[in-house]
Interface confidence: low
């Protein structure tokens, strides 16, 4: 089928286009080109007769068209009006006609665009800016670039006017950037030069440097002021409200105490019309001041509060030193120094952190010490202790009990007998006691600052007869060769003799046995399994005597090196192998077996029926005592001989 291809389809003004003919029929008489979508003699461009090779211009011929023998049409120096359809009319030798239509579009070559702005000096947080891409061109697409990137998504950015206008609402200093616009059509793309948006802002609150505010007499004072601002701020200095100079830096040499005061920096932006000020108070010391310690917490609570001690005053280029209890600071994770050593922080104070604390300022020739500061750490009350420790008294004596609990502030004490309040004193005195004074004696200690209370209860027995004693132990299951055990004979009674028996015999002489606390306590060092005996204590006075029930010591030991039985190591094939493992241990151990290193069963007896030479190898018994945390093992080599051969001793058994 006859077709027309336009090369190119989109043509720039001034360029050329070729209307290329495809599938031109054979045996042609001639052909003719027309402007438009149909054959119209008034719109004929050119005709061509093949026999004469004669081209004849038509009414629509502009002098820019060239026809080729293959019927293709070249149009040069294209103008906007050339846009549209073109029809080829082919006349064959048999005078049968055939037509085909093609088309192309003409676009102007775009000029380099430029950006116009409605506000060349917008003010931050106040103005909007509208950029417009010039010129306005038909059939062109408009694009925008910020710092050579496509537009970010922002509610403050708005495109309008077919994307030709970019509006920035409420500009900020961050909108200071390079903006470009680009125009595009099918035949060209052009980008504008950059436009830099100059946002006026500030001044922000100025900062005065350096930050330190304490100086020594004779030093130079050199203060610098800076405020973020566009255009750059103009600076003025005021001392105690009086104008000094319009410079960014203020320099006063060889200052004296009279230079102490408030120093104000004022920053002014003439374009935004805004002023901002910052004030710093400068203190000039006549000589290195004696340091002093300030605390953020004068009454810290133990295990609750942290305390920050600060060495005052803050002075530039000064070394700060600290002492606790007249010693340099100990290394402790609870002590922290600030970067400049000026602040010492005690984390989670304890009653031992009272001090005294001193700080010092290092001068050229000496160190100036602060006065010592003592922390008043509130603590307690701890569990009160009632003394004396006796619990048994004879009738007719005086009962004098004293109570004490560590506490700051000092605890307030109350006494209760059998739950009934008696008196609010630290000491309780009852003369000429009788059996009726037996009972529960409670001391209550109260800390009014923390609101905490602690109590201790003591049972007092008043009796002419000594009670039956009992034995208390500090370790009910001691481990052999490791632990010590202390037996104590209860109760503690005045004017009483304490005696001990082991397995019904008086105590043997041994360096591992020790009596203390008026023979009331019997200590066995490095207990052994042989110490697992019956222990009895006795008490006696001039009136009576009594013995405790026996207490048997349960010593944990082992496991010892196990024994595998029977001792045989050579077996005949077909026999049953029945190995038993035993280890002395308290409590009984856990047993397990391994054959050639491979775990087997967790039993005391290992049984294998009808063994063969495949059962040769090392048989290991492992014992473990979970109470002592100890393990042990033994290894035995087993040799199985084939039936009918004499089992000799195997080497390496």
């Amino acid at each position: 089928k006859l077709t027309i291809e336009s090369t190119p389809f989109n043509v720039a003004e001034g360029k050329e286009v070729l209307l290329l003919v495809h599938n031109l029929p054979q045996h042609l008489f001639g052909y003719s080109w027309y402007k438009g979508e149909r054959v119209d003699g008034n719109r004929q461009i050119i005709g061509y007769v093949i026999g004469t090779q004669q081209a004849t211009p038509g009414p629509a011929y502009s002098g820019r068209e060239i026809i080729y023998p293959n019927a293709s049409l070249l149009i040069q120096n294209i103008i906007q009006n050339d846009t549209g359809f073109y029809t080829l009319h082919v006349i064959k030798s048999d005078l049968v006609n055939e037509e085909a239509t093609g088309q192309f579009r003409v676009y102007p070559e775009l000029p380099k665009p430029s950006i116009s702005s409605n506000n060349s000096k917008p003010v931050e947080d106040k103005d909007a800016v509208a950029f417009t891409c010039e010129p306005e061109t038909q059939d062109a697409t408009y694009l925008w670039w910020v710092n050579n990137q496509s537009l970010p998504v922002s509610p403050r950015l708005q495109l309008s006017n077919g994307n030709r206008t970019l509006t920035l609402f409420n500009v900020t200093r961050n909108d200071t950037a390079s903006y470009k616009c680009e125009t595009q059509n099918p035949v060209s793309a052009r980008r504008s030069d950059s436009v830099i948006l100059n946002v006026l802002y500030g001044p922000d609150a100025p900062t005065i440097s350096p930050l330190n505010t304490s100086y020594r007499s004779g030093e130079n004072l050199n203060l610098s002021c800076h405020a973020a601002s566009n255009p750059p701020a103009q600076y003025s200095w005021f001392v105690n409200g009086t104008f000094q100079q319009s410079t960014q830096e203020l320099f006063i040499p060889n200052i004296t105490v009279n230079n102490s005061g408030s120093y104000t920096c004022q920053a002014h932006n003439s374009d935004t019309g805004l002023n901002r000020t910052t004030v710093t108070t400068i203190t000039v010391y006549a000589e290195p001041p004696k340091p002093f310690i300030t605390s953020n917490n004068s009454n810290p609570v133990e295990d609750e509060d942290a305390v920050a001690l600060t060495c005052e005053p803050e002075i530039q280029n000064t070394t700060y030193l600290w002492w606790v209890n007249n010693q340099s600071l100990p290394v402790s994770p609870r002590l922290q120094l600030s970067n400049d050593n000026r602040t010492l922080t005690l984390l989670s104070v304890t009653r031992n952190d009272v001090g005294p604390y001193e700080c010092g300022i290092q001068n050229e020739l000496s160190v100036d010490h602060s006065d010592p500061v003592i922390l008043n750490v509130l603590y307690g009350p701890d569990d009160p202790t009632i003394s004396p420790s006796y619990t048994y008294y004879r009738p007719g004596v005086n009962l004098s009990l004293s109570c004490h609990a560590a506490s700051n502030p000092p605890a307030q004490y109350s006494w209760l007998i059998d739950g009934n309040i008696q008196q609010h004193t630290q000491e309780l005195f009852i003369s000429n006691i009788t059996e009726k004074n037996s009972g529960l004696y409670t001391c209550q200690a109260n800390n009014s600052a923390s609101g905490h209370s602690r109590t201790t209860v003591k049972t007092i027995t008043v009796s002419a007869e000594l009670p039956k004693p009992s034995i208390s132990s500090n370790n009910s299951k001691p481990v052999e060769d490791k632990d010590a055990v202390a037996f104590t004979c209860e109760p503690e009674a005045q004017n009483t003799t304490y005696l001990w028996w082991v397995n019904g015999q008086s105590l043997p002489v041994s360096p591992r046995l020790q009596l203390s606390n008026g023979n009331r306590t019997l200590t066995l060092f490095n207990v052994t399994r042989n110490d697992a005996r019956a222990y009895v204590c006795g008490i006696q006075n001039s009136v009576s005597a009594n013995r405790s029930d026996p207490v048997t010591l349960d010593v944990l030991y082992g496991p010892d090196t196990p024994i595998i039985s029977p001792p045989d190591s050579s077996y005949l094939s077909g026999a049953n192998l029945n190995l038993s493992c035993h280890s002395a241990s308290n409590p009984s151990p856990q047993y397990s077996w391994r054959i050639n290193g491979i775990p087997q069963q967790h039993t005391q007896v290992l049984f294998i029926a009808k063994i063969t030479p495949n059962n040769n190898g090392t048989y290991a018994c492992f014992v473990s005592n979970l109470a002592t945390g100890r393990n042990n093992s033994i290894v035995k080599s087993i040799t199985v001989s084939a039936s009918g051969t004499s089992p000799g001793l195997s080497a390496g058994a």
Epitope: V479, K482, Q590, S592, P599, S624, R630
Partner: nanobody, 119 residues
Framework: EVQLVESGGGLVQPGGSLRLSCAAS????????IGWVRRAPGKEEELVAY????????RYADSVKGRFTISADTSKNTAYLQMNSLRAEDTAVYYC????????????WGQGTTVTVSS
């Protein structure tokens, strides 16, 4: 991966000393017991020394008591066997073996280091 690497073995004259090291990786030895076990041709395997790092408990075979000392440095995750007054009968391959306190027998073994006592 749990690994035990013994080192320190070698040839020494009778009466001499050696210090064996057992470097552990893949676990913390402070929660374990460590044993030095020796194997010699023609002899039964023998547990010569044993230490439980969580109790400090130590134990020695009668044949090495007073001559060998077992210790452990939990910060270096390493166990040691200091062997003094060495005898010909101490010649063996020495293995370090680790068992946790709840374990049955030795859970992990090293590859062994050879000690030869000979004049």
């Amino acid at each position: 991966e749990v690994q035990l690497v013994e080192s320190g073995g070698g040839l020494v004259q009778p009466g001499g000393s050696l210090r064996l090291s057992c470097a552990a990786s893949g676990f913390n030895i402070k929660d374990t017991c460590i044993g030095w076990v020796r194997r010699a041709p023609g002899k039964e395997e023998e547990l010569v020394a044993y230490i439980c790092n969580y109790t400090g408990y130590t134990r020695y075979a009668d044949s090495v008591k007073g001559r060998f000392t077992i210790s452990a440095d939990t910060s270096k995750n390493t166990a040691y066997l200091q062997m003094n007054s060495l005898r010909a009968e101490d010649t063996a391959v020495y293995y370090c073996a680790i068992t946790s306190y709840h374990g049955q027998g030795y859970n992990y073994w090293g590859q062994g280091t050879t000690v030869t006592v000979s004049s």
